[in-house]
Interface confidence: low
Amino acid sequence: DPASKSRSCGEVRQIYGAKGFSLSDVPQAEISGEHLRICPQGYTCCTSEMEENLANRSHAELETALRDSSRVLQAMLATQLRSFDDHFQHLLNDSERTLQATFPGAFGELYTQNARAFRDLYSELRLYYRGANLHLEETLAEFWARLLERLFKQLHPQLLLPDDYLDCLGKQAEALRPFGEAPRELRLRATRAFVAARSFVQGLGVASDVVRKVAQVPLGPECSRAVMKLVYCAHCLGVPGARPCPDYCRNVLKGCLANQADLDAEWRNLLDSMVLITDKFWGTSGVESVIGSVHTWLAEAINALQDNRDTLTAKVIQGCGNPKVNPQGPGPEEKRRRGKLAPRERPPSGTLEKLVSEAKAQLRDVQDFWISLPGTLCSEKMALSTASDDRCWNGMARGRYLPEVMGDGLANQINNPEVEVDITKPDMTIRQQIMQLKIMTNRLRSAYNGNDVDFQDASDDGSGSGSGDGCLDDLCSRKVSRKSSSSRTPLTHALPGLSEQEGQKTS
């Protein structure tokens, strides 16, 4: 139709200029479109350069939209992580503060001369919670062994207790149960509670990390072409008022985000496992009850040792022989005061319940994030047509869009009419992230069963640092405790000189 040749390019000029491009590129009136590489080759208001500029722009706009959606999800996960992390750390800090405030009065020198050992234990528990590759059972066993040696010496200042005698004491200890049931109870409960807390928080970290890394996956050239056709070809072909048909948009974005949709199954598994493990936050072996009450087990242990002192001493002498008397030493210590115990069951503050219920709701909301992404982006970012089916832009003209909507994921894109997808070449970054989701889900399932898991070597990029290695964001500001080579010397953290006065001030 010769009349169409003279159609003005005013609307395209307006849109093109608004994107920041030079208006000198835009023809005054439509020109023949044989030069077009992406848009249908009818009469057009777009030169080759304009088509290329708009293709690059549409690609960038989709990547921005994708990153924006990801950022919202990342922010939610980061907020959850911070809230839970703060709460769990607060519980442990509260327990340590209570210990520092009450043990000097309750146990006197039995505590003050060993304040470092207690502080080191809390340091180790913090490290363990934060994902350090510590074996909690061994850490606790070592703490009790050292504490027994030191307390036994303090309870018997009149005796000479050389290293070989203390080694013998250590060997007898398991059978004698000098601290009563406290070590066993603490070990069983603490392992379950800490592993549940740290795996849940780490799950949030891994989820956030996966979203961040996937958002950086570039969209391929075939996707760029399809998005250009979807968004700007209508303008080039002189139907600028026509908005994309909904099903057409979905097919384009399902093709573009085919690899991302393959995250769906493992993403759901991870979120399900995270929701499930929150069951372990309640009850007598629950996170709140245990982490906030470490000091009460320690108090029970010292009380038990004092109560059992005479029996223990007799059995140790029976098993290890009579130790030599220290001529310079004072007489045997008087029976020491019993430390008053705080109730072991902390009344729930309600904070954790609130955090968990919010987290469950939010995790459920984002379960279908990856497969709903094409639909979400189409409806929120692509200004879809709300007109009748035959009045929308179908990629060729204004009219009905006939092809069916493809399924989700890479394999289902084999016949996608809008984006040429090579289903034999999955994106490697996304495959790695699927692997990360699987690994974390397995950890959470192990944690649900109360099993400790190795939190090292989960990094997927081989760099040896970053948030894939079992640390909380950049809270990898931790290290495995410095154990000195001799089992007789105290744990040598470099902050051992916290005096009792300072210890009581900590808050």
Epitope: R119, Y122, S123, D473, D474, S477, R478, A494, P496, E502
Partner: antibody, heavy 123, light 104 residues
């Protein structure tokens, strides 16, 4: 990049108090323990003290114990050293340092970054 | 204090080892200072960890209660005083060595 910027040095009067401030940037301040180290003219390094990441625990070297207080403001990314009852032997360049770790237990062997130092002369 | 040699000299390209002993926590850090009172740079912390901006020719190790700083293929710009830092459990204090002057 991690930067630590000390201020508050200069000429001080014996018997008075000194307050040095270290402003940190380029890292998540609240996650890391912070230390103060000093160097007297022509001498070696001397550990002054350390504060834990949360600010709840401190520890001091023998030469300043009882006179020094280290505090921190995690909102402002600052750590402060207050040294009372100044003596001539407190004359030194004072360095603020960041630990690579963030729990009660950081020592000088864990320092991974230093400030440029601020000179204090007690005379 | 920790014990370290007062001076060490080497030709460019040679390997230099500086030792530090006397710490009871078996943890050492190594710090470079090009002139007295000037900026300090950590070359090794926590025995063997190297800050990201430090060249790979610097490495650290610990054996028993002795820490060692190794500079493989020493360069002229490595000329400086190197202090080691560690911990003494008998005094509950963090301590430094007196410094080793490296001349290249």
């Amino acid at each position: 990049a991690v930067t630590l910027d000390e201020s508050g040095g200069g000429l001080q009067t014996p018997g008075r108090a000194l307050s040095l401030v270290c402003k940190a940037s380029g890292f998540t301040f609240s996650n890391y323990d912070m230390l103060w180290v000093r160097q007297a003219p022509g001498k070696g390094l001397e550990w002054v003290g350390v504060i834990s990441s949360s600010g709840s625990s401190t520890n001091y070297g023998a030469a300043v114990k009882g006179r020094a207080t280290i505090s921190r403001d995690n909102g402002q990314n600052t750590v402060r050293l207050q040294l009372n009852n100044l003596r001539a032997e407190d004359t030194a360049t004072y360095y603020c340092a960041k630990s690579a770790y963030g729990y009660y237990g950081s020592g000088v062997s864990d320092i991974d970054a230093w400030g440029l130092g601020t000179e204090v002369i007690v005379s | 204090a920790l014990t370290q040699p007062s001076s060490v000299s080497a030709n460019p390209g040679e390997t230099v080892k500086i030792t530090c002993s006397g710490g009871s926590g078996n943890n050492y850090g190594w710090y470079q200072q090009k002139s007295p009172g000037s900026a300090l740079v950590t070359v090794i912390y926590d025995n063997n960890k190297r800050p990201t901006d430090i060249p790979s020719r610097f490495s650290g190790s610990t054996s028993g209660s002795t820490g060692t700083l190794t500079i493989t293929g020493v360069q002229a710009e490595d000329e400086a005083v190197y202090f080691c830092g560690g911990y003494d459990s008998s005094t509950y204090a963090d301590i430094f060595g007196a410094g080793t002057t490296l001349t290249v």
